[in-house]
């Protein structure tokens, strides 16, 4: 499965859309910065078989989709940009699912690393908790937008390593 050919352009478009989504100056939100504990080790890609790496990427995109699909999110971001964002995420999820299906039977290892999936879920739980504690304020959403952009950039590095593995 040649993932990056179908996927990396969509990833770049997703980052571009997120960059346009900002509604307020991030400079006014400096004191709202927060340590979400991004699970860097899950995106290093060294300990993974390809199928497991794909499942981690899939979980991150699915959780991002869930996060930005809430009514609180819809009330914060521009509707047109959100729709474009959903479209790109949906495309990436489809690409990854197709890839996972192709990996079935190719490797002896399990398709999913359950611990890694749980780690990614807990990371997004921390993000959701932060938003709740901050009452979904504009600055809280700005901080989360910056965090998700960073996590997408870091996941792009994992995709690049996957491409080189082929």
């Amino acid at each position: 499965c040649d993932l990056p050919q179908t996927h990396s352009l969509s990833n770049r478009r997703t980052l571009m859309i997120m960059a346009q989504m900002g509604r307020i100056s991030p400079f006014s939100c400096l004191k709202d910065r927060h340590d979400f504990g991004f699970p860097q080790e899950e995106f290093d890609g060294n300990q993974f078989q390809k199928a497991q790496a794909i499942s981690v990427l899939h979980e991150m995109i699915q959780q991002t989709f869930n996060l930005f699909s809430t009514k609180d999110s819809s009330a914060t971001w521009d509707e047109t940009l959100l729709d474009k964002f959903y479209t790109e995420l949906y495309q990436q999820l489809n690409d990854l699912e197709a890839c996972m299906m192709q990996e079935v039977g190719v490797e002896d290892t399990p398709l999913m690393n359950v611990d890694s999936i749980l780690t990614v879920r807990k990371y997004f739980q921390r993000i959701t908790l932060y938003l709740t504690e901050k009452k979904y304020s504009p600055c809280a959403w700005e901080v989360v937008r910056a965090e998700i952009m960073r996590s997408f950039s870091l996941s792009a590095n994992l995709q690049e390593r996957l491409r080189r593995k082929e």
Epitope: A19, P26, D32, R33
Partner: antibody, heavy 121, light 107 residues
Amino acid sequence: EVQLVQSGAEVKKPGESLKISCKGSGYSFTSYWIGWVRQMPGKGLEWMGIIDPSDSDTRYSPSFQGQVTISADKSISTAYLQWSSLKASDTAMYYCARHPGLNWAPDFDYWGQGTLVTVSS
Amino acid sequence: DIQMTQSPSSLSASVGDRVTITCRASQSIDRALNWYQQKPGKAPKLLIYFASSLQSGVPSRFSGSGSGTDFTLTISSLQPEDFATYYCQQSFDFPLTFGQGTKVEIK
């Protein structure tokens, strides 16, 4: 390798204009803010202002507001600091440094080598 | 503006000494404090960020602690290359502000 490379030393006369630069490489230039810091001879560090190269949004220290202009050209990964009318008191070393914005990551983790500006009649 | 006050402004110490520099903020800044080292003619170098996180590549003899208004930089065993000026800087809110610096000299 992440690098911030600043333009060379400048010698100017009072009243002249000047624009110094800071070119980023080895990372996504628009993913980090660029801050400017002044150090007058024998003195400490003073934060001047900062720019988000993704949209050129800026924030200045009140001490430097109206005295300097910070700008950026993301197409060439370069930030600028400029004066329209220099004063002798602007004589200093000027540093640029990158900042992670709203991300929980090290602040000002990479610095330029500095640009020495000398203003003398 | 948040004022940052470092103490002492200078100190003399010997190689192997334990050195402590303090930094006080004029209001609570949570853990949003960084420490930098600067040698003559060189750009500052980040040592510690968010009060206690050691920057990549910095020797473990450097450590930071504190939160709120009071912070400390400790060098557990001073080395010859550690003689320099040290600055704290708050990154809690704009305008960002630095301490006035602490010069560590050879006794």
